[in-house]
Interface confidence: low
């Protein structure tokens, strides 16, 4: 019968040839009366066999990541008779791994959106590196992830690449962050290779800012001849939030005379002061009203940021018109 052990050849060997092992028949008494032959893909180009001894050699540098095993066939012939001494046999040569591939992030570019003020532990995104080395060969493809840039706001789970929030962030201070993740093979041991990737993390807005008037006092004038419905001026608040979180509604908080109204221009987010009742200079030549401003949409869980509405005082001077 055939006699051999399992065959392994290390990849990326720099020698011209490498002895892998020996294939032989137990009928071979060593008198060179048998001839060994190698058949199959790679026979003669990648592997050769010593016809007399059955020793197998690799004569080419191998790359396990290109091909990890070779299935070959062996024959042994009695030189004198030309007949097969043993039935043809199939055997496998496995290419053993060395750590010659760095981890690579294949799904770049990474981008994630997470709401500002998200609590610690919130999952942001998972980055995954691939290592072309053999996962079953030591630690060549066992990866550990670490954060090179992004502290103290983010953390990464070492074995999964899951990025989480580790500190609350305020979009109004900074609306995006670049996080740099490193993946190291060999579980970080000496000889490890590494790869890095960048993750752009954008903060989406939450309604954590209330609108605030730009001025604490506005001075407006109205002609006593102005009809009801006349726009007599605008007031303006600012809101550090964006989009619908910055949409606001103006209203009268105090107007004893009930002479004025405020409507909101939702295009410009300005408050328009409107004459509700005609004024008479001779009857009253100035008015003082108080206006307030609130956001249009405030989710229940964010009401703590909106406890007291911003107010402003509006002084309105009535202009005299000569009356016949």
């Amino acid at each position: 019968g055939w006699v051999w052990n399992q065959f392994f050849v290390p990849e990326e060997m720099n020698t011209t040839s490498h002895h892998i092992g020996q294939l032989r028949s137990d009928l071979d008494n060593g008198n060179n009366s048998f001839q060994y032959k190698l058949l199959g893909a790679g026979a003669g180009s990648t592997f050769i066999i010593d016809e007399r001894t059955g020793d197998i050699y690799a004569i080419q540098k191998l790359d396990r990541e290109e091909r990890s095993l070779y299935i070959l066939r062996a024959q042994v012939i009695d030189i004198a008779t030309g007949r097969a001494v043993e039935p043809e046999s199939e055997f496998v040569i496995k290419v053993s791994d060395i750590n010659d591939n760095e981890p690579k992030f294949l799904d770049e570019p990474y981008e994630a959106i997470v709401p500002e003020m998200s609590p610690e532990g919130t999952l942001v995104i998972q980055v995954t590196a691939s290592d072309a080395d053999d996962p079953s060969s030591g630690n060549n493809a066992r990866l550990l992830y670490s954060l090179l840039q992004g502290q103290p706001y983010f953390s990464v789970e070492p074995t999964t690449g899951v990025i989480r929030i580790s500190s609350k962030m305020d979009r109004e201070l900074q609306d995006e962050y670049w996080v740099i993740i490193q993946a190291k093979d060999m579980i970080g041991q000496p000889g490890a290779l590494s790869g890095t990737t960048s993750v752009l993390i954008k903060l989406s807005d939450v309604n954590d800012n209330k609108p605030i008037f730009k001025e604490s006092l506005y001075r407006l004038t109205v002609s006593e001849s102005a009809p009801t419905g006349t726009s007599i001026g605008t007031i303006m608040a600012y809101d550090n939030d964006i989009g619908e979180n910055a949409e606001m509604d103006y209203s009268i908080e105090e107007d004893d005379s009930q002479t004025f109204d405020i409507i909101t221009n939702h295009e410009t987010q300005e408050g328009i002061v409107i004459l509700k009742k005609k004024v008479d200079f001779e009857h009253q030549n100035h008015y003082g009203i108080r206006a307030k401003v609130k956001n249009h949409h405030v989710p229940e869980q964010l009401m703590k940021y909106h406890t007291e509405a911003s107010t402003t005082f509006i002084k309105i001077q009535v202009e005299d018109v000569d009356e016949p």
Epitope: P115, S118, P119, T122, I125, Q126, T128, P135, T159, T160
Partner: antibody, heavy 121, light 107 residues
Framework: EVQLLESGGGLVQPGGSLRLSCAAS????????MNWVRQAPGKGLEWVST????????YYAESVKGRFTISSDNSKSTLYLQMNSLRAEDTAVYHC??????????????WGQGTTVTVSS | EIVMTQSPVTLSLSLGERATLSCRAS??????LAWFQQKPGQAPRLLIY???TRATGIPARFSGSGSGTEFTLTISSLEPEDFAVYYC?????????FGGGTKVEIK
Amino acid sequence: EVQLLESGGGLVQPGGSLRLSCAASGFTFSSYAMNWVRQAPGKGLEWVSTISGGGANTYYAESVKGRFTISSDNSKSTLYLQMNSLRAEDTAVYHCAKGGMGGYYYGMDVWGQGTTVTVSS
Amino acid sequence: EIVMTQSPVTLSLSLGERATLSCRASQSISSNLAWFQQKPGQAPRLLIYGAFTRATGIPARFSGSGSGTEFTLTISSLEPEDFAVYYCQQYNYWPLTFGGGTKVEIK
């Protein structure tokens, strides 16, 4: 096609042990997290345990911590749940579920039909 | 642990009607929420993950929305095969937790 086939359920007395298996096929087993989820008769779903691809991380529900052990054999593409010190409240159908990709790594995208565990004297 | 609360417990609707199922998390889970469908005697089936991404092979009549603590599963027009129990599940924090389920039944 991804397939998950659970086995190992049965009737066991309180305090006894059982080992559940989940044979996986149709995907690279070692690349995905795997989960056990149970469902008591007439009740909702309850997460039991998760193991990450490669087995580096394991997580357990408080109700089973110290009694159940999750493990996997990549060479056999098989997930296991060793259940010790079983109690009546562990009676349920036990499903294994494959994890997903990316932000859904610790999710559950394909489920097995389940194996029934009954703990009773 | 994060408590997931589903409402209503039972939803009685007719074929072709729109179903709106709610799921509330006891604290923000970002968009890390999945919805499952389960029929009697069957394994759960993933419908939605990431709060709004439909799983492979799930019909377009199923849609998910929400983020933070409030989530909704909408079935735009109920088909006979949609009458089942629906569960939401968060995968943002350990332990992973499921809602108690909403049973969608024929009126």
